[in-house]
Interface confidence: medium
């Protein structure tokens, strides 16, 4: 398989609601019609798959119904959003892109986006 460059931001801070968004951009060497995007989380040298979607160029990304990810595509960019994050989910989130069809097959893996998640402070009790 052929290597392909994938770019993603180095650092992203999740919102107070536990939502983090980042762009994954790949340098497509050809006109792919079928693309697969996988988000991997690396923490303590362990790599786990967070979510994945296969899409046809020009169509929306479709993640599984119970996925914590959503996304949109525009050309060679994929806008990924991960929801429901908590402080314990802080880690390096790696974007993996595969150009599935037509052949040849290309594989690209980004350097990862460090997502920092800070659990919101509980609201203090109010007298009012």
């Amino acid at each position: 398989c052929k290597a392909m460059h994938v770019a993603q931001p180095a650092v992203v801070l999740a919102s107070s609601r536990g939502i983090a968004s980042f762009v994954c951009e790949y340098a497509s060497p050809g006109k792919a019609t079928e693309v697969r995007v996988t988000v991997l989380r690396q923490a303590d040298s362990q790599v786990t798959e967070v979510c994945a979607a296969t899409y046809m160029m020009g169509n929306e990304l479709t993640f599984l119904d119970d996925s914590i990810c959503t996304g949109t595509s525009s050309g060679n960019q994929v806008n990924l959003t991960i929801q429901g994050l908590r402080a314990m989910d802080t880690g390096l989130y790696i974007c993996k892109v595969e150009l599935m069809y037509p052949p040849p097959y290309y594989l690209g893996i980004g350097n990862g986006t460090q997502i920092y998640v800070i659990d919101p402070e509980p609201c203090p009790d109010s007298d009012f």
Epitope: Y101, P102, P104, Y105
Partner: antibody, heavy 121, light 107 residues
Amino acid sequence: EVQLVESGGGLVQPGGSLRLSCAASGFSLSTGGVAVGWIRQAPGKGLEWVSAISGYGSTTYYADSVKGRFTISRDNSKNTLYLQLNSLRAEDTAVYYCARLPYSAYAFDYWGQGTLVTVSS
Amino acid sequence: DIQLTQSPSSLSASVGDRVTITCRASQGVSSYLAWYQQKPGKAPKLLIYAASTLQSGVPSRFSGSGSGTDFTLTISSLQPEDFATYYCQHHYGTPLTFGQGTKVEIK
């Protein structure tokens, strides 16, 4: 061990229909990283790619010669691949092979034994 | 569509001979070419992919080379079980097409 076993071939009249099956074992048809497809070989002739279906999704692809007449599908629960052949013509007479197509190589690494489809009146 | 032309269409050789089959693509396919062996009444068997990568379990007497439009399959020392028909197939764009085949017969 990877195995592919085709069935469903036979004699059919021009304009008729047939459904070919390919039972897979030793790997999952829905596994990412591999597609599966059909290749045919007319008697005494060479090989012709017919159709393929992706492993991750269910994206389908066809050769122009069969587009609109043939339909590829799979049943993940049965780990079986199908090819529905409609509006058959004499030139569709061939041995139909199902084969596995790893994306990393895009070459057919495992083949079934083939099933003969004869279109004749 | 990319056309693949194999030469020769057939050849006669003896056990122990060095055999070379060529495959020419109508346009460049980089190194995205595979070779198959087919014996009568049997399914094809993958020998080489990506022009020169030997498929697991295939004897080392088989080798492939080439890039762009011109490719070669070489059998360094022909064995009795090698008498068969050989096909090339590109994997660069679609449709995936095959060469017309080269039949290797016993001299």
